[in-house]
């Protein structure tokens, strides 16, 4: 893709249900620019159905999140830093989720616990990006009757069968100055060969993930293009009449401050229902994770602890995390108390975000670390390594990655 810029704004909204948008496992994050701030299409797919503990498969339901891309041996490295020496503890910043499918669907990446999967309250990092290949279906993607993945649905109007996701983070992709939305984890971007997802939680860690429900999205699929069309009022007069009829005074929005402050950058462009289809997932396989440090994040199942390994993931020199000020991101585990910061991620065409399957945030399982916090992401140090600081953004990205991998069973 031609270096689409993605702005990631993590929106922690614990309150409503979000319509989940499709998330491309690889490369493309579906970015939905919801005209309604309320609508949060999370990329993460919440499993429409939570698999039963007995392992029985519920049709189309994948309940695990997959999250990172293993490097040779990292591939084998457990979430917990159990890999053999030299292995990158399975934490590869990129988990390539099959383009278009979630790791969960593919069965790759972290394995979310039912609890995680069932959690409707999830922090979702949504990267809305354009995917090359909008194909790819997720069992768990929220789809309309037509089978198309719905992108943004207003809160409270989550697509049927989908669990509402509360903390949805959406990341708008190159879209007009619309409010940024934090990326939500859902299906990993599909385009790619590598999407920048990291799967934070591992199967063994039921709450280790940032409580992001695993979405059963297909593996590394390239995102589908979804257009959210909101039809503008047919005529100004009609709009007026409608407004006039409403005796309710219009709220003084001037004094209203968006939760995320995203409205600050909003520019209203007349044209009423212009809908932009931002669903094109970014081919993260070419995305360079500019967060260089993501490579060092290892997801350890069980705990929310993130261990930063000194080993640098081999992103093939193509992945550079551009998340820049992750250092400023602070995730407060355990509650909706999160600090959301907006960061622009520039995915370069040649950058390979290993988040597809490669970026794995390793969390220590409670057993291992005893840390029960959902996830501790460290800040990225100047060296590019993540210094154990909470980073909601990383978490959401990781969640996205994990979700797509999960679909694939990776």
């Amino acid at each position: 893709m031609a270096e689409p810029r993605q702005e990631f704004e993590v929106m922690e909204d614990h309150a409503g249900t979000y319509g989940l948008g499709d998330r491309k496992d690889q490369g493309g994050y579906t970015m939905h620019q919801d005209q309604e701030g309320d609508t949060d299409a999370g990329l993460k797919e919440s499993p429409l159905q939570t698999p039963t503990e007995d392992g029985s498969e519920e049709p189309g339901s994948e309940t695990s999140d997959a999250k990172s891309t293993p490097t040779a041996e990292d591939v084998t490295a457990p979430l917990v830093d159990e890999g053999a020496p030299g292995k990158q503890a399975a934490a590869q910043p990129h988990t390539e989720i099959p383009e278009g499918t979630t790791a969960e669907e593919a069965g790759i990446g972290d394995t979310p616990s039912l609890e995680d999967e069932a959690a409707g309250h999830v922090t979702q990092a949504r990267m809305v990006s354009k995917s090359k290949d909008g194909t790819g279906s997720d069992d768990k993607k929220a789809k309309g009757a037509d089978g198309k993945t719905k992108i943004a649905t207003p809160r409270g109007a989550a697509p049927p069968g989908q669990k509402g996701q509360a903390n949805a983070t959406r990341i708008p992709a190159k879209t007009p100055p619309a409010p940024k939305t934090p990326p939500s984890s859902g299906e990993p971007p599909k385009s790619g060969d590598r999407s920048g997802y990291s799967s934070p939680g591992s199967p063994g860690t039921p709450g280790s993930r940032s409580r992001t429900p695993s979405l059963p999205t297909p593996p590394t699929r390239e995102p589908k293009k979804v257009a959210v069309v909101r039809t503008p009022p047919k005529s100004p007069s009609s709009a007026k009449s409608r407004l006039q009829t409403a005796p309710v005074p219009m709220p003084d929005l001037k004094n209203v401050k968006s939760k995320i402050g995203s409205t600050e950058n909003l520019k209203h462009q007349p044209g009423g229902g212009k809908v932009q289809i931002v669903y094109k997932p970014v081919d993260l396989s070419k995305v360079t994770s500019k967060c260089g440090s993501l490579g060092n994040i290892h997801h350890k199942p069980g705990g929310g602890q993130v261990e930063v390994k000194s080993e640098k993931l081999d992103f093939k020199d193509r992945v550079q995390s551009k998340i820049g000020s992750l250092d400023n991101i602070t995730h407060v585990p355990g509650g909706g108390n999160k600090k959301i910061e907006t960061h622009k991620l520039t995915f370069r065409e040649n950058a390979k975000a290993k988040t597809d399957h490669g970026a794995e945030i390793v969390y220590k399982s409670p057993v291992v670390s005893g840390d029960t916090s959902p996830r501790h992401l460290s800040n990225v140090s100047s060296t590019g390594s993540i210094d154990m600081v909470d980073s909601p953004q990383l978490a959401t990205l990781a969640d996205e990655v994990s979700a797509s991998l999960a679909k694939q069973g990776l």
């Epitope: 309940t63 591939v75 917990v80 278009g100 350890k300």
Partner: antibody, heavy 119, light 109 residues
Framework: QVNLRESGAEVKKPGASVKVSCKVS????????MHWVRQAPGQGLEWMGW????????KYAQKFQGRVTMTRDTSITTAYMELSSLRSDDTAVYYC????????????WGQGTLVTVLA | SYVLTQPPSASGTPGQRVTISCSGG????????VSWYQQLPGTAPKLLIF???QRPSGVPDRFSGSKSGTSAPLAISGLQSEDESDYYC???????????FGGGTKVTV
């Protein structure tokens, strides 16, 4: 050292069921998906499905829906794949393979269990 | 039949470069990452390439994968006798909603 050790060869009759186990060691069992892939004699690989070792959630290939059941016992870090209503064409080597966490693929495989279905 | 298409065989002499093709469609390779496996006679498959072009540690850099559109070739440069094996490509298929493999390519050195 990651290791996936599968149970021994089995000979079954048509209509019977077979349950293959995959004992895992060397990594956090619940942190990865376990996939099952089979390979008929002289044939290629065929994916059967996966189980989320952590939650027990499963996903099966359409071809095996209704006949395969994947389970796991986290206490003994073992995954199981049971295939019922066996037919002669189910004769194959059944592999358990770990879903890569950091990439797209199956990073570790069991040695395989040969299941022979004889009339 | 296999969803992903691979040539049944390929051969080369030591030192040569051999490329194995793996072609599919928009619902699989076109939209998902590809992985490659090497299966030596009588053994279980081994991950060779994951996420299109990533090599697990321990895999010689002679093996390289790539993906373009709906095709994902595996190249083996500097062919060696120990490379004689069966190679399988795999990816997720959105339509089938499952993993799919190629029929395998037997490489003879």
């Amino acid at each position: 050292q990651v290791n996936l050790r599968e149970s021994g060869a089995e000979v079954k009759k048509p209509g019977a069921s077979v349950k293959v186990s995959c004992k895992v060691s060397g990594y956090t069992f619940t942190g990865y998906y376990m996939h099952w892939v089979r390979q008929a004699p002289g044939q290629g690989l065929e994916w059967m499905g996966w189980i989320n070792s952590n939650s027990g959630a499963t996903k099966y290939a359409q071809k095996f829906q209704g006949r395969v059941t994947m389970t796991r016992d986290t206490s003994i870090t073992t995954a199981y794949m049971e295939l019922s209503s066996l037919r002669s064409d189910d004769t194959a080597v059944y592999y358990c393979a770990r879903g890569a966490r950091d990439g797209y693929g199956f990073d570790y495989w069991g040695q395989g269990t040969l299941v022979t279905v004889l009339a | 039949s296999y969803v992903l298409t691979q040539p049944p065989s390929a051969s080369g002499t030591p030192g040569q470069r051999v490329t194995i093709s793996c072609s599919g469609g928009s619902s699989n390779i076109g939209s998902n990452a590809v992985s490659w496996y090497q299966q030596l006679p009588g053994t279980a498959p081994k991950l060779l390439i994951f996420t299109n072009d990533q090599r697990p540690s321990g895999v010689p850099d002679r093996f390289s994968g790539s993906k373009s559109g709906t095709s994902a070739p595996l190249a083996i440069s500097g062919l060696q006798s120990e490379d004689e094996s069966d190679y399988y490509c795999a990816t997720w298929d959105d339509s089938l909603n499952g993993w799919v493999f190629g029929g395998g390519t037997k490489v003879t050195v």
